[in-house]
């Protein structure tokens, strides 16, 4: 049975085996086409999600589709039902929390009272000014809190207590990529992890440990990527894995927060990377122990210089490393998080690509998660 499962796939009606390599090859080899059913699927960017959260105290903003203008949500008459609608619009299914936060003198966007219409937030047309003088601070999910804060050093062994959202993504029980838990059903990783194997069956997720081999595997229901853009072949290196069964959160299994839409990190901002990847470029082996390192944002202009990536780093990517080199993500770290800590930990980047590992002029290049929030929300909504 194990051998059969490893090398063959069972088609139904009529029952017969086909070689596993014929799974997800674009050809219907089973009469009912089930060999092409459980494959990595692409999902378009989709329409603009009409709600978003700002780094200014996680305040809620709503889009007026008629004008294309964004507005801050006034706390006047805001209810739990409206909070749930806002979070559902972003694809969250968990129970949100919200509170009033005072409008600051530098409030830029106009402030409006919010209502609901066909499961979407809208501006209340007949409303008056924002009398409470408060905005809605909304949290759709408790995220980004760990039991232990890492120390700021170069590279060191990591504890799952520090990074409870880190997972190992494995194919045929072999670690291929890292990933991050975003909510009980979803793991964030890189699309290029699935280039070789596009069937969902043999992919598994392992969560809750910092040792590679020691924790139970979780079945995967779906793997979703963005449609390929031939104009920018390295763009869109992002994937979402939907787990077959929701995770139960604990001290060692917790979600990391998505970034805010306006999370603009300036050069030299401190960030963290983690992974079980190669400790030496072009060789060595995977690390059995999770490793962590502190890095910093590297200016995109510097990153695109002639002695570096020569313009290959697009607006949907970011660079991180240390100016003198030597600390970087490497093979096997792909898909793992590039993390920023404010009040909570946020996954601002996904380990994507780079030339070599740890070179001074070629730092790691990461998928900029804030550029894909709309896509993430649309995927989640479609799967609610």
């Amino acid at each position: 049975k194990v051998i059969l499962d490893k090398y063959y796939f069972l088609c139904g009606q009529p029952l017969h085996f086909i070689p596993r390599k014929q799974l997800c090859d674009g050809e219907l080899d089973c009469p009912l086409g089930e060999d092409e059913e459980h494959c990595v699927k692409s999902f378009p960017e989709g329409p603009a999600v009409a709600v978003r959260l700002s780094k200014d105290r996680s305040t809620l903003q709503v889009l007026d589709s008629a004008t294309g203008n964004w507005f801050s949500a006034c706390f006047d008459n805001f209810t739990e039902a409206l909070a749930e609608t806002a979070c559902r619009q972003m694809g969250y299914s968990s129970k949100p929390t919200f509170r009033a936060v005072e409008i600051g003198p530098d409030q830029d966007l106009d402030v409006v009272e919010i209502t609901e219409n066909s499961q979407e937030l809208r501006m209340r047309n007949s409303s008056g000014p924002c009398l409470s003088g408060s905005l809605v601070s909304l949290h759709c999910l408790a995220c980004g809190k760990s039991l232990k804060t890492p120390r700021v050093v170069g590279v060191e062994e990591a504890s799952v207590d520090s990074w409870p959202w880190q997972v190992s993504i494995q194919y045929d029980k072999q670690h291929v990529c890292g990933g991050s838990i975003l909510d009980p059903h979803w793991v964030l990783t890189a699309a290029h992890c699935f280039r070789k194997h596009t069937d969902v069956f043999n992919w598994k997720v392992r969560a809750g440990s910092d040792k590679l081999g020691s924790f139970p595997s979780l079945a995967v229901a779906k793997i979703i990527i963005i449609e390929f853009n031939p104009m920018y072949p390295k763009d869109n290196d992002i994937a979402l894995m939907k787990l077959q069964f929701p995770l139960t959160f604990s001290g060692t299994v917790r979600p990391i927060c998505l970034p805010f839409f306006d999370e603009e990190l300036t050069p030299a901002t401190p960030l963290w990377i983690i992974g079980w990847g190669f400790t030496k470029q072009n060789g060595g082996k995977m690390s059995d122990i999770l490793l962590q390192a502190s890095v910093q944002v590297i200016d995109s202009t510097r990153c695109n210089a002639d002695d570096a990536y020569q313009g290959e780093v697009t607006e949907k990517m970011m660079c991180a490393g240390i100016p003198e080199g030597g600390v970087d993500t490497c093979q096997g770290d792909s898909g793992g998080p590039l993390m920023y800590q404010s009040d909570q930990w946020h996954v601002v980047g996904i380990v994507s690509w780079g030339y070599g590992c740890g070179g001074p002029s070629t730092p790691g290049v990461y998928t900029k998660v804030s550029a894909y929030l709309n896509w993430i929300y649309n995927v989640w909504k479609a799967e609610l």
Partner: antibody, heavy 121, light 107 residues
Framework: QVQLVQSGAEVKKPGASVKVSCKAS????????MHWVRQAPGQGLEWMGW????????NYAQKFQGRVTMTRDTSTSTVYMELSSLRSEDTAVYYC??????????????WGQGTLVTVSS | DIQMTQSPSSLSASVGDRVTITCRAS??????LAWYQQKPGKAPKLLIY???SLQSGVPSRFSGSGSGTDFTLTISSLQPEDFATYYC?????????FGQGTKVEIK
């Protein structure tokens, strides 16, 4: 675009009252507080009070309490400022001014063209 | 009431000069401060809000700084159209109060 059009100049006798209008257009009238600010000839700016066009609620500077009344007519998107018991020192240009965004402490961004009220016997 | 004191009350400058106007509040107003420009016979125009946020459409040569009680409006390179009177205004508490104004004249 946002426009605030005020009524024309007035000449009044001491003790009389004056009512200045300010007609708003180009935005949702009920959503933004309207302030009144005056400026005596060659002098600085002086805040008089505000009105909430949605509810009609008002707040006046202590100095004008009892003499000033701010009202609104939602059907015509117009606010009014009436000042009674006029004295010569009330001679000034009176401005209505709409806040930048829809809450109270936002500074005025849009201003009417001003209405000169002259109090003279 | 919160008193707002501007200095100088007037200044003479040439085109291209860097001009600085200060405004002091009688108590802390955080950054609840706006700056206006007014030309003769015209309504005031909002330049800066929240002490340092540039109002959309205002040239970037205007900048504001400060918090608490001391604030500054700077014009980095004075242009012919900048000759006017400038007012600061606090919206920390009612009644709102304005500075007495600073008149910027051609030298």
């Amino acid at each position: 675009q946002v426009q605030l059009v005020q009524s024309g100049a007035e000449v009044k006798k001491p003790g009389a009252s004056v009512k200045v209008s300010c007609k708003a257009s180009g935005y949702t009238f009920s959503r933004y507080f309207m302030h009144w600010v005056r400026q005596a000839p060659g002098q600085g700016l002086e805040w008089m009070g505000w009105i909430n066009p949605n509810s009609g609620g008002t707040n006046y500077a202590q100095k004008f309490q009892g003499r000033v009344t701010m009202t609104r007519d939602t059907s015509t998107s117009t606010v009014y400022m009436e000042l009674s018991s006029l004295r010569s020192e009330d001679t000034a240009v009176y401005y209505c001014a709409r806040v930048r965004i829809g809450w109270l402490q936002s500074p005025p961004l849009y201003w009417g063209q001003g209405t000169l009220v002259t109090v003279s016997s | 009431d919160i008193q707002m004191t501007q200095s100088p009350s007037s200044l003479s400058a040439s085109v291209g000069d860097r001009v600085t106007i200060t405004c002091r509040a009688s108590q802390s107003i955080s950054t609840w401060l706006a700056w206006y420009q007014q030309k003769p016979g015209k309504a005031p125009k909002l330049l800066i809000y929240a002490a340092s946020s540039l109002q959309s459409g205002v040239p970037s040569r205007f900048s504001g700084s400060g918090s608490g009680t001391d604030f500054t409006l700077t014009i980095s390179s004075l242009q012919p159209e900048d000759f006017a009177t400038y007012y600061c205004q606090q919206s920390y508490g009612f009644p709102w109060t304005f500075g007495q104004g600073t008149k910027v004249e051609i030298k």
